[in-house]
């Protein structure tokens, strides 16, 4: 029986050009974690494997850094980074646990937001 639960950072927002840490935490299980995958929709961002360590997908190498812990740091954010991110914990004997994070990347400064909503 799968007793574990995944706690995530939930729905988060960050500014364009900035960085954000995506984090998931598996608890309430003694199952052995063998690998953690990070995915954006259907794209693989990174893998942390017990024996092989971290692998960052080549297309994200310049903008993704592993850590802290099993988290993932996304840098130089663009509006295109808005969307769903998934952490997938592969465990034995429980199986797979999945956590979901929604990231919204906002246009940069508060001043810009203010200007956009000025009354003519």
């Amino acid at each position: 029986m799968m007793t574990g639960t995944i706690e995530t950072t939930g729905n988060i927002s960050a500014e364009k050009g900035g960085s954000i840490i995506l984090q998931c935490h598996l608890s309430s299980t003694t199952a052995q974690v063998t690998q953690v995958n990070w995915e954006q929709q259907d794209q693989l961002l990174a893998i942390c494997n017990a024996d092989l360590g971290w692998h960052i997908s080549p297309s994200f190498k310049d903008r993704v850094a592993p850590g802290p812990g099993l988290g993932l740091t996304l840098q130089s954010l663009t509006v295109n980074d808005t969307g769903e991110y998934f952490c997938i914990y592969h465990t034995y004997p429980d199986g797979t646990y999945t956590g979901r994070i929604f990231l919204e990347v906002l246009e940069s400064s508060v001043a810009e937001h203010g200007a956009r909503f000025q009354i003519p």
Epitope: H25, L26, V33, C48, A50, K61, A65, G67, G69
Partner: antibody
Framework: QVQLQQPGSELVRPGASVKLSCKAS????????MHWVKQRHGQGLEWIGN????????NFDEKFKSKVTLTVDTSSSTAFMHLSSLTSEDSAVYYC??????????WGQGTTLTVSS | DIVLTQSPATLSVTPGDSVSLSCRAS??????LHWFQQKSHESPRLLIT???QSISGIPSRFSGSGSGTDFTLSINSLETEDFGVYFC?????????FGGGTKLEIK
């Protein structure tokens, strides 16, 4: 098997600098964070900082930022910690430790640094 | 920075006893808490990772529990080889930090 090899000891003069090494073997060096930890005689453990050899990314405890430089040589799978402007407060055992899926799962034997005139 | 407070600082026990060591974080670190054992003149050794995950090669008498700010390392039926200092460490945020340690000594 995974090993982190560190020199047993270093003796340096106050005011000088030293470069401590940590040679990794038995795994893909560029895929695991390497951390450095300080332990003064009979005291607790202090996290100094880390480096990801795959990119050179570093993080430091603020306390050590002006004292420490972390580098790697991927061709020899070796991590280095450069300590500058040494004082007696820097006398300690310095460990390198690897972080992967299971946190700090491998440790070096530690280098005992003695700062003395 | 996240401060980890371990208690008690020293624990005097007899082989065969069972003990619980506490580690409290100054803010939530979810499950990003690890336990180490260090014997005199040796490097630390990882016992439990991510609060409750066991490590291959570590005796089953060691177990971990907790989440958020309160964590416990339990050792069932202590053996003489278990005496030493135990440290907790968090990897939730940089800078990583260690607790001050609990010394387990023979009564």
């Amino acid at each position: 098997q995974v090993q982190l090899q560190q020199p047993g000891s270093e003796l340096v003069r106050p005011g000088a600098s030293v470069k401590l090494s940590c040679k990794a073997s038995g795994y893909t060096f560029t895929s695991f964070w390497m951390h450095w930890v300080k332990q003064r005689h009979g005291q607790g453990l202090e996290w100094i900082g880390n480096i990801y050899p795959g990119s050179g990314t570093t993080n430091f405890d603020e306390k050590f930022k002006s004292k420490v430089t972390l580098t790697v040589d991927t061709s020899s799978s070796t991590a280095f910690m450069h300590l500058s402007s040494l004082t007696s407060e820097d006398s300690a055992v310095y460990y390198c430790t690897r972080e992967g899926l299971y946190a700090f799962d491998q440790w070096g034997q530690g280098t005992t640094l003695t700062v003395s005139s | 920075d996240i401060v980890l407070t371990q208690s008690p600082a020293t624990l005097s026990v007899t082989p065969g006893d069972s003990v619980s060591l506490s580690c409290r974080a100054s803010q939530s670190i979810r499950s990003s808490l690890h336990w180490f054992q260090q014997k005199s003149h040796e490097s630390p050794r990882l016992l439990i990772t991510y609060a409750s995950q066991s490590i291959s090669g570590i005796p089953s008498r060691f177990s971990g529990s907790g989440s958020g700010t309160d964590f416990t390392l339990s050792i069932n039926s202590l053996e003489t080889e278990d005496f030493g200092v135990y440290f907790c460490q968090q990897s939730n945020t940089w800078p990583y930090t260690f607790g001050g340690g609990t010394k387990l000594e023979i009564k």
